[in-house]
C-alpha cells in the first residue's frame, strides 16, 4: 500500500474491538488503527473479520478474503457509534462461533485474534473474558491484546496468550498508530519460501522453510511443517529446528515426478494451519546428479 511492512501469511484474522461508551470520542483512532493494519495483511489466502463489543458482541463483517467486502466492512466500522458496557467476552464468543463453524468443515485454518480494549474489566467481566479467550484458544486461535489508556496489563496478559502477546498503548488513543509496526511483526506468521523448492522424486530431503513468526507459538514444541500433496493427502512433520525466520524440516518422500506439495505450518500440533502459496515440486534426478 504505502511501502510499509506487510504480512504474506494465509490465516484467519479476527479484530475484536471495544465500542463501549468510554471509547466514544476515540473511535476514529481505533478505526484508523484497524484500517492501517488491515491493509498490511496482503495474502490472497488471508481472511478477515471485524467484531465489535459493548453490551453484546456483534459480527460487523464475517470472515472473508474478498477485498471489496473488506473495504465495505471498513466503511461499516467507521460508522460505528460507541456506547454501552465492556462485555469483551461477548466479542470472543463471536470469534469462537466463526472458528467453530469453519472447523466443522474439516480443514482447519489458523486463527489470529487481535482484541482491543480500554479500561479495566471488573471482576466478573474479566473472568468471562478470560474464559472465552481460553475457548478461542481451545479452537486453535492465537490471541493478542491491545490495551489503551486505563487498561490492566495483568488482566490482558491472562486474556492474551502471554504477556508477550499484549501491546500496551500508554500514551492514549493517538499513540495507536505507533504500534502498527510491532503488532504486524508479532502477529504475522508467514511462509515466504522453501529451499530447495524442487526435490528429486523418490529421495529423502530436508527443506528449509523461510518466513517469519515461527516462534510466536505458545509452545514451539507444537510447531509442525505440513505438506499437502497434490491437493489431497496431508503429511505433518516435526521440524528439526524452529527459529523465528526459518524452520528446518524433513520433506516427505514424493515418489513420482511432477508431484506437488503445498507448504503449510501448524503452530499447535496440527489443530490448525497457516497456508501459503509456496509449492515444492519433484523432478527426475539421474544418478550422480
Amino acid at each position: 500500500e504505502d511501502g510499509g511492512p506487510a504480512c504474506y501469511g494465509g490465516f484467519d484474522l479476527y479484530f475484536i474491538l471495544d465500542k463501549s461508551g468510554s471509547v466514544l470520542h476515540h473511535w476514529n483512532e481505533i478505526y484508523y488503527f484497524v484500517e492501517q493494519l488491515a491493509h498490511r495483511f496482503i495474502s490472497p489466502q488471508l481472511r478477515m473479520s471485524f467484531i465489535v463489543f459493548s453490551t453484546r458482541g456483534t459480527t460487523l463483517m464475517k470472515l472473508t478474503e474478498d477485498r471489496e467486502q473488506i473495504r465495505q466492512g471498513l466503511e461499516e466500522l467507521q460508522k460505528v457509534l460507541p456506547g454501552g458496557d465492556t462485555y469483551m467476552h461477548e466479542g470472543f464468543e463471536r470469534a469462537s462461533e466463526q472458528i467453530y463453524y469453519e472447523n466443522s468443515q474439516g480443514y482447519r485454518t489458523a486463527s489470529v485474534i487481535i482484541a482491543l480494549t480500554d479500561g479495566e474489566l471488573h471482576e466478573d467481566l474479566f473472568f468471562y473474558s478470560e474464559r472465552e479467550a481460553n475457548r478461542s484458544r481451545d479452537l486453535g486461535a492465537i490471541v493478542y491484546c491491545v490495551g489503551v489508556k486505563d487498561f490492566n496489563e495483568t488482566q490482558l496478559a491472562r486474556i492474551a496468550d502471554s504477556k508477550d502477546h499484549v501491546f500496551p498503548v500508554n500514551d492514549g488513543f493517538q499513540a495507536l498508530q505507533g504500534i502498527i509496526h510491532s503488532i504486524l511483526k508479532k502477529s504475522c506468521i508467514e511462509i515466504l519460501a522453501a529451499e530447495p523448492s524442487t526435490i528429486c522424486a523418490g529421495e529423502s530431503f530436508q527443506v528449509v522453510v523461510r518466513g517469519n513468526g515461527f516462534r510466536h507459538a505458545r509452545n514451539v514444541d507444537r510447531v509442525l511443517c505440513s505438506f499437502k500433496i497434490n491437493d489431497s493427502v496431508t503429511l505433518n512433520e516435526k521440524p528439526f529446528a524452529v527459529e523465528d525466520t526459518y524452520l528446518l524440516c524433513p520433506a516427505p518422500i514424493l515418489k513420482e515426478v511432477g508431484m506437488k506439495a503445498a507448504l503449510q505450518v501448524s503452530m499447535n500440533d496440527g489443530l490448525s494451519f497457516i497456508s501459503s502459496s509456496v509449492i515444492i515440486t519433484t523432478t527426475h534426478c539421474s544418478d550422480g546428479s
Partner: antibody, heavy 117, light 108 residues
Framework: QVQLVESGGGLVQPGGSLRLSCAAS????????LSWVRQAPGKGLEWVSN????????YYADSVKGRFTISRDNSKNTLYLQMNSLRAEDTAVYYC??????????WGQGTLVTVSS | DIELTQPPSVSVAPGQTARISCSGD??????VHWYQQKPGQAPVLVIY???KRPSGIPERFSGSNSGNTATLTISGTQAEDEADYYC???????????FGGGTKLTVL
C-alpha cells in the same frame, strides 16, 4: 456411527418432576457441548438448555429457568435434563443434540413428555 | 434479542427452485442455520453458517444471508424434499439459540 438416544419421557401431572437421559456414542463425548431442544405437538422448535463440554457452564431459556437443570456425566457419555414444577406448556417431544455455538449437527430421535392431570 | 420470521408455507413444482426466507433485524450480522424435519422424525441440519453444507447433504441445497434476510434455496426440488424447514441463529450464551417458526414446503 454418531448417535444420541433419549429416554425417560412419559406422562406426569402438573407440578411433578421427570428426568430425561440422553446416551451418546460414536464421537468424543467430552469434546462437545450438548443441548436440549423441544417441540410442542404441532408447533415449532424451541431451544431449552445448553451445557459446555466439561459441564462447567450451563444456560437456560427463560421459560424453564429455575425449574430445569441440565447436567452431564462424561464418564458415562450421558446427558441429563432434570425437570421440576412441570406445567402443561412443557408438553413436547424433547430432543438432545450435539451443539456448538448454536449449531446442532447431530440430533436424537426425541422422547415425548406429556404434562396432564 | 433477534427474532426470526419465516413464511408458514411455500409450494413448488418438482424440478423447480424453492426459496424459503428467514428474516430478522440486521440478520446479516448473525450466522443462520437451516434444519429439515420430516413428519415423525428428528430435525436434520442441511445448511450451517449461512451457506455451508454438511457432508451427505445434496448439492441442490444452498444458503445465503444478506441485509435482513437469509434464504434457503433448493434447486431442482424433489418430492423427498417435502418437509418443514426451520432457520435458527445463535444469539450468544446469555440468550441461546433462536428458531424461526418453520416453513412447510409442499412439492406439488
Amino acid at each position: 456411527q454418531v448417535q444420541l438416544v433419549e429416554s425417560g419421557g412419559g406422562l406426569v401431572q402438573p407440578g411433578g418432576s421427570l428426568r430425561l437421559s440422553c446416551a451418546a456414542s460414536g464421537f468424543t463425548f467430552n469434546s462437545y457441548g450438548l443441548s436440549w431442544v423441544r417441540q410442542a405437538p404441532g408447533k415449532g422448535l424451541e431451544w431449552v438448555s445448553n451445557i459446555s463440554s466439561n459441564g462447567s457452564y450451563t444456560y437456560y431459556a427463560d421459560s424453564v429457568k429455575g425449574r430445569f437443570t441440565i447436567s452431564r456425566d462424561n464418564s458415562k457419555n450421558t446427558l441429563y435434563l432434570q425437570m421440576n414444577s412441570l406445567r402443561a406448556e412443557d408438553t413436547a417431544v424433547y430432543y438432545c443434540a450435539r451443539a456448538g455455538y448454536g449449531l446442532f449437527d447431530v440430533w436424537g430421535q426425541g422422547t415425548l413428555v406429556t404434562v396432564s392431570s | 434479542d433477534i427474532e426470526l420470521t419465516q413464511p408458514p408455507s411455500v409450494s413448488v413444482a418438482p424440478g423447480q427452485t424453492a426459496r424459503i426466507s428467514c428474516s430478522g433485524d440486521k440478520l446479516r450480522e448473525y450466522y443462520v442455520h437451516w434444519y429439515q424435519q420430516k413428519p415423525g422424525q428428528a430435525p436434520v441440519l442441511v445448511i450451517y453458517g449461512d451457506n455451508k453444507r454438511p457432508s451427505g447433504i445434496p448439492e441442490r441445497f444452498s444458503g445465503s444471508n444478506s441485509g435482513n434476510t437469509a434464504t434457503l434455496t433448493i434447486s431442482g426440488t424433489q418430492a423427498e424434499d417435502e418437509a418443514d424447514y426451520y432457520c435458527s441463529s445463535w444469539a450468544g450464551s446469555r440468550s441461546g439459540t433462536v428458531f424461526g417458526g418453520g416453513t412447510k414446503l409442499t412439492v406439488l
